[in-house]
């Protein structure tokens, strides 16, 4: 109890009436008007409640506060009087705010602001629409994906901000008179090949395709390892080189190094480099055969396989490269005795003679060219004395009828070891690779070591066997005549040739042995 007669226990938001009673403050109410016990409370009266007598008037909102209330203008409206709050309708001066005037950038870049009572809307510019999640924000309409298909099928649609373009597809161009961009654009395929707009490598030929182009290897060329054919970035290499690789199953560092050189020469090969490339290959071969290194430690049969592979490949490579030479006669010789003679001509009707240190070859020009082949005619002769090392003890396989005849009359005499190579090994080739049956024979004159008296001299060629190796054979070759250090041979095909000395005695006037000649 207060000495002044006022209760000290009055609840919050109340005041004492006397020493035993309290009353709620204005804006608060309790269960009974006079509070006589401390357990009672004073609660805020919500003047803004629906049944309340308070009326703020139009364009305004009532805001309840602790023990009171405020009238405020609704969003989008403001009081003319400037007073932010008021208590009743008579004090209400709320009127609409023109947001568009207040903030001209309200609709950002792509909309026009339109004022409404208490608010505003954004009217989007052509090519824009209101964003569903933010109806005040205009966003670009993608005409290309909206299903309108506004462009011709020969073009592709490019969406722009607020617009779109119909552009020619890559590899296409506007048809004459057509623009490139508006929705009436119509395009046609560009022939990149004839217009020179392609990026094909010089090792390929350009082929136009609809809307694009592809690059295909030139005839006689193949795609570089790992690069597909018929692509824009196809790069090819001359098959002349790519097929001449070490024979399978032969392990020789010396041989690998030779073939590495061949592949290096082929990597950036161009037709204009033919002369230098031929010389470099023969230089490398000359060095290989001068110092065969670990090739000499291989079993004899493997050495014969290597020789066979080298002879076969060399012929193909020289034939391929020679077609890129200009007309004329070429002669190259190398330290270890390798020699090349080449004649390149537009086809002429005469015989050709190629002369070398140890061999001469004569044949008709008309053999050189395959009919219908537009390239130049090439006749070539390579002497490869170093090949003799690899062909030591190579077998001689006679035709069955010759073999049988000899077997009947000279039993056991041919078992007397392998024939001896008397001459350099030579390889003859033409631009025409179909040389298995010449229409007129080729004549070779070999210079060679002295013949041991009463030994048989044979004109032979190297026959590449099915197994990739080979042997000496006489089929299609005949010995026209022989002196102590020279022999004339005539053959009806081209390959690699030599003169052998057979290991048996020749009987005087032996009719059987004349069969061989």
């Amino acid at each position: 109890q207060d000495s002044r007669g006022c209760a000290r226990w009055c609840p919050q938001d109340s005041s004492c009436v006397n020493a035993t009673a309290c009353r709620c403050n204005p804006g608060f109410s309790s269960f009974s008007e006079i509070i006589t016990t401390p357990m009672e409370t004073c609660d805020d009266i919500n003047e803004c409640a629906t049944l309340s007598k308070v009326s703020c008037g139009k364009f305004s909102d009532c805001w309840n506060t602790e023990g009171s209330y405020d009238c405020v203008c609704s969003p989008g409206y403001e009081p003319v009087s400037g007073a932010k709050t008021f208590k009743n309708e008579s004090e209400n001066t709320c009127q609409d705010v023109d947001e568009c005037q207040q903030n001209p950038r309200l609709c950002k870049s792509y909309g026009t602001c339109v004022n409404t009572l208490g608010s505003y809307t954004c009217q989007c510019l052509p090519g824009f629409k209101l964003k569903p999640e933010d109806p005040k924000l205009c966003t670009d309409v993608n005409e290309c994906t909206s299903g309108q298909n506004p462009c011709h099928s020969s073009t592709h649609c490019l969406n722009n901000v607020g617009s779109y373009q119909c552009r020619c597809r890559p590899g296409w161009q506007p048809i004459p008179g057509s623009p490139n961009g508006p929705n009436n654009t119509v395009c046609e395929d560009v022939d990149e090949c004839s217009s020179g707009q392609h990026q094909c490598d010089s090792s390929t030929v350009c082929f136009n395709t609809v809307g694009s182009y592809s690059c295909r290897c030139r005839p006689g060329w193949k795609p570089r390892h790992g690069i597909p054919n018929n692509q824009k970035d196809t790069v090819c290499e001359d098959m002349t080189f790519s097929t001449w690789t070490p024979p399978p199953g032969v392990h020789s560092q010396t041989l690998s190094r030779f073939f590495d050189k061949v592949q290096d020469l082929g990597r950036d090969y161009k037709p204009g480099l033919a002369n230098n490339t031929i010389q470099s290959i023969l230089q490398a071969l000359d060095e290989l055969l001068e110092a065969p290194g670990d090739l000499e430690t291989l079993p004899r049969l493997q050495q014969h396989c290597v020789a066979s592979h080298l002879l076969d490949g060399l012929e193909d490579v020289l034939r391929g490269l020679s077609k890129n030479l200009s007309n004329g006669l070429l002669n190259f010789s190398y330290p270890a005795g390798t020699e090349l003679s080449l004649e390149v001509q537009k086809q002429v009707d005469r015989s050709v003679t190629l002369r070398q240190n140890q061999a001469v070859m004569q044949l008709d020009w008309n053999q050189a060219q395959k009919s219908g082949d537009p390239g130049p005619s090439v006749v070539g002769l390579v002497s490869i004395p170093g090949m003799g090392k690899l062909l030591a003890e190579a077998p001689l396989v006679l035709e069955p009828e010759k073999q049988m005849l000899l077997h009947e009359t000279h039993q056991g005499l041919l078992q007397d070891g392998s024939p001896i190579l008397l001459s350099d090994v030579i390889s003859a080739f033409l631009s025409n690779n179909d040389t298995q049956n010449l229409s007129s024979p080729v004549t070779f004159t070999f210079s060679h070591r002295s013949v041991i008296p009463r030994q048989k001299v044979l004109c032979v060629f190297w026959e590449h066997g099915q197994n990739g190796c080979g042997h000496w054979a006489t089929t299609g070759c005949s010995t026209i005549g022989t002196r102590d250090t020279s022999t004339i041979c005539r053959c009806t095909h081209l390959s690699s040739f030599a003169v052998l000395m057979a290991h048996y005695d020749v009987q005087e006037e032996d009719p059987v042995l004349t069969v061989i000649t």
Epitope: L265, K270, L273
Partner: antibody, heavy 118, light 106 residues
Framework: QVQLQQSGAEVKKPGASVKVSCKAS????????MQWVRQAPGQGLEWIGA????????RHTQKFKGRVTMTADKSTSTVYMELSSLRSEDTAVYYC???????????WGQGTLVTVSS | QIVLTQSPATLSLSPGERATLTCSAS?????MHWYQQKPGLSPKRWIY???KLASGVPDRFSGSGSGTDYTFTIRRLEPEDFATYYC?????????FGQGTKVEIK
């Protein structure tokens, strides 16, 4: 006799381009690749690339991809090397050299000094 | 790319002495070439295809090697031989040079 005559010295600003020429004489222009090699002051030799005059085919190092253009004019037996977007580290003597795989670069131009400075 | 490492970087010798320069490749190389360069001058081809002397090169120079290891030798140094020598491979693109060996007078 074989001769390779290069264009004169150039001073360029960073970002600019330079085009160096190399006129060949005394041999068949299409029988060799023409190589481009550069040498920065006090440094070693650096291969830029090569052009084959016969068909305009080129080879170049990845380092210069997109910046170097090598061309050949058969009518004047001249090759060109253009280097764009120059930076100070492109300051060097630029050489052209006749080349073939098995022979190396057997004839060299006298060199063209390109200075890149702001 | 094939990296060529030349050693030593500098070789200090007196005239009459033997100089041996080496060039080591990160992969096997078939065609190795050597060039001589003197200050302010263009390089000159000196040895090509491992061991062949370029025209006008005296026979006191020689080259050898195969695979990844190559050697350039000057049998008896003459005053005009003091220069920088570069090896260069042509077995794969890009073509690469060694960083050079400077042969200087001791």
């Amino acid at each position: 006799q074989v001769q390779l005559q290069q264009s004169g010295a150039e001073v360029k600003k960073p970002g600019a381009s330079v085009k160096v020429s190399c006129k060949a004489s005394g041999y068949t222009f299409t029988n060799y690749w023409m190589q481009w090699v550069r040498q920065a002051p006090g440094q070693g030799l650096e291969w830029i690339g090569a052009v084959y005059p016969g068909d305009g085919d080129t080879r170049h190092t990845q380092k210069f991809k997109g910046r170097v253009t090598m061309t050949a004019d058969k009518s004047t037996s001249t090759v060109y090397m253009e280097l764009s977007s120059l930076r100070s580290e492109d300051t060097a003597v630029y050489y052209c050299a006749r080349g073939f795989t098995a022979y190396g670069m057997d004839y060299w131009g006298q060199g063209t000094l390109v200075t890149v400075s702001s | 790319q094939i990296v060529l490492t030349q050693s030593p970087a500098t070789l200090s010798l007196s005239p009459g002495e033997r100089a041996t320069l080496t060039c080591s490749a990160s992969s096997s190389v078939s065609y190795m070439h050597w060039y001589q360069q003197k200050p302010g001058l263009s390089p000159k081809r000196w040895i090509y295809d491992t061991s062949k002397l370029a025209s006008g090169v005296p026979d006191r120079f020689s080259g050898s090697g195969s695979g990844t290891d190559y050697t350039f030798t000057i049998r008896r140094l003459e005053p005009e031989d003091f220069a920088t020598y570069y090896c260069q491979q042509w077995s794969s693109n890009p073509l690469t040079f060694g960083q050079g060996t400077k042969v200087e007078i001791k």
